[in-house]
């Protein structure tokens, strides 16, 4: 039934209001049943089939072949002490499109999870002659032309809008029912916003001479990718290594993963200079900086800002 | 068209050099990291080296490492392989491929080019 | 050790199902993808990082990851998916690593 108190339609295509004590009704038919309008300055007007030739009514529906923009206002079921009350807004169809944008449903669909899309009217279903679905107003060559369907692992150029349009006949003529999804495909809400452990900035007592080991850590996903910078461009310096990653899994299916940069044989050229750690994701990049200064130096600086 | 399309491949001598360049078009070049990756005859793929989007940070396989140098232009949709100091086991097909993600180095390369053949030989 | 170790050669019936492995200690950590190679053409994913499979690519083949070895499957294999096969992932260095790829027959 037509449990919904407030409807927006199109104009233009075939819409029905269903009471919801349908079940009631057929129990007790000698029953007096009736549908009434009200808009504007009409009070309760009476529906019958003599009202609009595009009106028709049976025990537990009222029918509109088709709605028009003149249909707009409430209406009222009415059964011994049973009442129900819509409002229905019937809505200009838009000319220059498939679909009409106020009449989407949007639904958001993570990557790799499994995506459906079935073009299926139960109400009018035996009216139906073909069924055709549509991608942002293209349609799509798909086997079954009475019940269209998708089915799939979402991919990111799955994302559009997708139009169900049923066509069906009554009274010799042709209608049509469109139902349109608007599909946003969005990244594996499981994955996490990549972060960097630790100060942003770290200030490293060193030694000449001595070597160093700068520890970066990060909690990141799989794909995520964690890198020191250390401006290689100016002539690979031998005395720089990144060493291999190490990564343990976290309980919760996420990973720790860790990045040394080692500097041996510290020369005046490695001190006071921005070495940065990276983690990549596709939220973007977060960094951190370490900065190697002479211990001898250290006074200069506030001591909560050195990192062992 | 999204494409790659590869050159400056040739036959060489063993302790010359080659530039090769790969031709990107119908994506946005600037937003990806870029592979090179080879195919000696009969044999298997073999990863060369990556470059991150902005140029930035490149990385080598350890049996280029010192002799071939990864560059790219973004202004050009172009990128480079500089490969100096060739040596016979660098014949290959040469193929620039570009990463499936917004994260540079991915292993997941979903564009390749058709591949330009080196010959390194005395 | 970053190498993959995959079968050299695989054989299959027209319409069975066939499964590729690939192992190596990278794989406990990091993605691996899959590519497809006919002779004399370039490499094509078949299967991207997040066992994702990208655009034109048909659902008989899945990829699947457990412990240090991954997988693709093949599921109602056809003639034109003869061919070979060879899996990749990053490794700790921050480099990608290709397994040495599987012959794939199908009979």
């Known amino acids: 039934c037509t449990s919904r108190p407030h409807i927006t339609v199109v104009e233009g295509e075939p819409f029905y209001l269903k009471h919801c004590s349908c079940s009631l009704a057929h129990e007790i038919e000698t029953t007096t049943k009736s549908w009434y309008k009200s808009s504007g300055s009409q009070e309760h007007v009476e529906l019958n089939p003599r009202s609009s030739s595009r009106i028709a009514l049976h025990d537990c529906v009222l029918e509109f072949w088709p709605v028009e923009l003149n249909d707009t206002g409430s209406y009222f079921f009415q059964m011994k002490n049973y009442t129900q009350k819509w409002k229905l807004n019937v809505i200009r169809r838009n000319k220059h499109s498939c679909f009409t944008e106020r009449q989407v449903t949007s639904k958001i669909v993570e990557v790799k999870k499994f995506f459906q899309i079935t073009c299926e009217n139960s109400y009018y279903q035996t009216l139906v002659n073909s069924t055709s679905l549509y991608k942002n107003c293209k349609k799509l060559l798909l086997e079954n032309n009475k019940n269209p369907t998708i089915k799939k692992n979402a991919e990111f150029e799955d994302q559009g809008y997708y139009s169900c349009v049923h066509f069906l006949h009554h009274n010799g003529k042709l209608f049509n029912i469109t139902k349109t999804f608007n599909i946003t495909i969005v990244e594996d809400r499981s994955n996490i916003v990549p972060v960097l452990l630790g100060p942003k900035l770290n200030h490293v007592a060193v030694e000449l001479g001595k070597n160093v080991r700068l520890n970066c850590s990060a909690l990141l996903n799989e794909e995520d990718v964690i890198y020191w910078m250390f401006g290689e461009e100016n002539g690979s310096d031998p005395n720089i290594h990144e060493e291999k990653e190490m990564r343990i899994m976290t309980p919760e299916g996420k990973w720790h993963a860790s990045k040394v940069l080692r500097i041996e044989n510290i020369g005046e050229s490695n001190l006071n200079v921005l070495y940065n750690c990276t983690v990549a994701s596709t939220g973007g990049t977060d960094t951190k900086s370490f900065i190697l200064v002479r211990k001898a130096d250290m006074a200069d600086i506030p001591g909560h800002v050195f990192t062992r | 068209e999204v494409q790659l399309v590869e050159s400056g491949g040739g036959v060489v001598q063993p302790g010359r050099s080659l530039r090769l360049s790969c031709a990107a078009s119908?994506?946005?070049?600037?937003?990806?990291?870029m592979h090179w990756v080879r195919q000696a005859p009969g044999k298997g793929l073999e990863w060369v080296a990556v470059i991150s989007n902005d140029g930035s940070k490149k990385y080598y396989s350890d049996s280029v490492k010192g002799r071939f140098t990864i560059s790219r232009d973004n202004s050009k949709n172009t990128l480079y392989l500089q490969m100096n100091s060739l040596r016979a086991e660098d014949t290959a097909v040469y193929y620039c491929a570009k990463g499936s993600s917004s994260i540079w180095l991915t292993s997941a390369l979903n564009l390749w080019g058709q591949g330009t053949t080196v010959t390194v030989s005395s | 050790s970053s190498e993959l170790t995959q079968d050299p050669a695989v054989s299959v019936a027209l319409g069975q199902t066939v499964r590729i492995t690939c192992q190596g200690d990278s794989l406990r950590s990091y993605y691996a993808s899959w590519y497809q190679q006919k002779p004399g053409q370039a490499p094509v994913l078949v299967i991207s990082a997040k066992n994702n499979r990208p655009s034109g690519i048909p659902d008989r083949f899945s990829g699947s990851s457990s412990g240090n070895t991954a997988s693709l499957t093949i599921t109602g294999a056809q003639a034109e998916d003869e061919a070979d096969y060879y899996c990749?992932?990053?490794?700790?260095?921050?480099?990608?690593?290709f397994g040495g790829g599987t012959k794939l027959t199908v009979l």
């Open positions: 990749a992932s990053r490794n700790g260095w921050n480099h990608v690593v």
């Open positions: 119908g994506f946005t070049f600037s937003g990806y990291g």
